[in-house]
Interface confidence: low
């Protein structure tokens, strides 16, 4: 049986049930190579409370559809009068990066995961030449996720004192120059995640090979190497390599750009101070507020919720967008789709799409940017579920009683972008964490 998602095969992935202090290792094409789970375990569960391991999915007992992967075991669930077996079930949804498997829940018999990944899309528009896992769990099982830093087109310019060269990098995947053929990047070789531009020439100085690693709680490392043989003539016989160290700052701060800290014989060391290197609970909330000791800030967007069936309306040329954030009030136009953002075609108001659902909500505050994300909307032709990204700005003189109003700024591959100036986005900072 052919592997259903070959792009995901090269790695053993991790997911965590934080409530029960359980770490899962997942290898969807082979086995996880953990002795305690046996030789053919595809999903190995490490219970850190009891310090035990259990195989909860066998690679031999795999069944797959386009969007669901199930691994059975021969282990009985011991439920009275039933013949159920322990199994793992992974639901795949189209995403714009390789993504991460997320633990959803576990019943006594079944361990459920959800995975938004390019591997599950109907079209290849989001697929990279080369991409590696871009998240890691620290020793306290807290997730550090750099997926939001991955550029689907273009690259980051590294801050470097050399006026004759420019070093461009992407995070965890190669630089896509086709989707964004900027003049400097156009010459970058395919597959490169670190491209050195000198004059009109561009050189591959590193490609992603291994996933993100954690070296200390607040320091993550990504290494790129030049895969192909043949040395570059300016490298003194050495093979180029790039090491990017992502550092979680000791207190809340604006974002910085990656800085070159050392360079010798085409070995480049880059340091990037970014809150995306911090653990995810420090940055994100599933509600419309972020507060408490853990986050160092107080943010509450719940006053933006509309009551009485009214919605915010944002004009998007061909479409009108109806938004109802931070609540569970149905948008009247949106036909009981549980939409937080609803897209209605002006020329045909029967064409209605959910552009993100209110129970699929993430509030994120990172590197000084406050963003509310609604995902899980109606599918586009690629298989990607529409989503909306609302970027908030603090404005203490915003109209509409300080609430302000969302402004549609554009759409890229079924992701809809809005900006929203409001006094409720003014962040109150606490002491550092």
């Amino acid at each position: 049986q052919a592997a259903p998602f070959p792009e995901l095969c090269s790695y053993t992935w991790e997911a965590v049930d934080t409530k029960n202090n359980v770490l899962y290792k997942i290898n969807i094409c082979g086995s996880v190579d953990i002795v305690q789970c046996g030789p053919s375990s595809a999903v190995c569960m490490h219970d850190l409370k009891t310090r035990t391991y259990h195989s909860v999915g066998d690679s031999v007992l795999r069944s797959a559809t386009r969007s669901l992967l199930e691994f059975n075991t021969t282990v009985s669930c011991d439920q009275q009068g039933t013949n159920h077996r322990v199994q793992s079930s992974i639901a795949f949804l189209c995403g714009k990066t390789l993504g991460t498997p997320e633990f959803v829940t576990a019943t006594f018999c079944v361990h459920y995961f959800e995975w938004r990944t390019t591997a599950a899309c109907k079209k290849d528009i989001f697929k990279a030449n080369k991409e590696v896992p871009c998240y890691v769990f620290d020793e306290e099982l807290r997730k550090h996720d750099l997926n939001p830093l991955i550029k689907l087109s273009g690259a980051y310019l590294v801050d470097d004192s050399d006026p004759d060269t420019s070093l461009f990098i992407n995070v965890c995947r190669d630089i896509d120059t086709l989707r964004d053929p900027g003049s400097q990047l156009r010459a970058c070789p395919p597959g490169t995640a670190a491209c050195l531009v000198r004059g009109h020439q561009a050189f591959d100085v590193g490609q992603p090979r291994d996933g993100l690693k954690v070296v200390r709680k607040d320091r993550l490392v990504l290494s790129y190497v030049r895969e192909e043989a043949g040395k570059l003539d300016f490298c003194d016989g050495h093979s180029p390599a790039v090491t990017i160290t992502f550092v979680c700052p000791s207190e809340r701060r604006e974002g910085t750009i990656p800085k070159l800290t050392a360079k010798s014989n085409c070995r480049y060391e880059i340091e990037w101070i970014t809150e995306y290197a911090c653990h995810r609970d420090y940055l994100e909330s599933k509600t419309c507020s972020l507060s408490g000791e853990q986050q160092d800030v107080s943010i509450d967007l719940t006053p933006l919720a509309q009551s009485g069936g009214s919605s915010y309306i944002s004009d998007g040329k061909e479409y009108l967008f109806y938004l109802n954030v931070c609540g569970e009030t149905e948008i009247q136009f949106c036909n009981k789709k549980q939409a937080a953002v609803c897209q209605v075609k002006k020329s045909d108001t029967s064409q209605v799409k959910a552009a993100g659902r209110y129970h699929n909500q993430t509030l994120r505050y990172s590197d000084g940017d406050l963003t509310l994300i609604y995902f899980g909307g109606d599918e586009c032709s690629s298989g990607f579920q529409r989503m909306s990204v609302i970027n908030f700005e603090c404005n203490k003189t915003a109209g509409n009683d300080g609430k302000g109003t969302p402004v549609f700024t554009g759409e890229v591959d079924c992701t809809y972008f809005f900006t929203w100036d409001t006094e409720y986005a003014c962040v109150h900072h606490h002491h550092h964490h």
Partner: nanobody
Framework: DVQLVESGGGLVQPGGSLRLSCAAS????????MDWYRQAPGKQREWVAT???????TYADSVKGRFTISRDNAKNTVYLQMNSLRPEDTAVYYC??????????WGQGTLVTVSS
Amino acid sequence: DVQLVESGGGLVQPGGSLRLSCAASGIIFSDNRMDWYRQAPGKQREWVATLASYGWKTYADSVKGRFTISRDNAKNTVYLQMNSLRPEDTAVYYCKASSPVLNDIWGQGTLVTVSS
């Protein structure tokens, strides 16, 4: 001292039953995955059954439906109930405790002979 001690082996006729016990000392018994293995004369040691700490059980195809693994946490003991025994079940039976924080611990074995 960490150790496992098996007992309950002996001579039994085909179709008969035996219950093997494996008593553990020096380990947090309930934290460990417990396995039974067996080794017939002149053959490789083979896995028989597993009882994970959650109570999940799994068996080798050759014993499925005939053998049952269970545990008594209060007595720090794991059992292997063997019914409908066959001559090919003749072997030394070993229990093993698996823990991520300790090396695997094996018992010294108990001999089961199935013969008429």
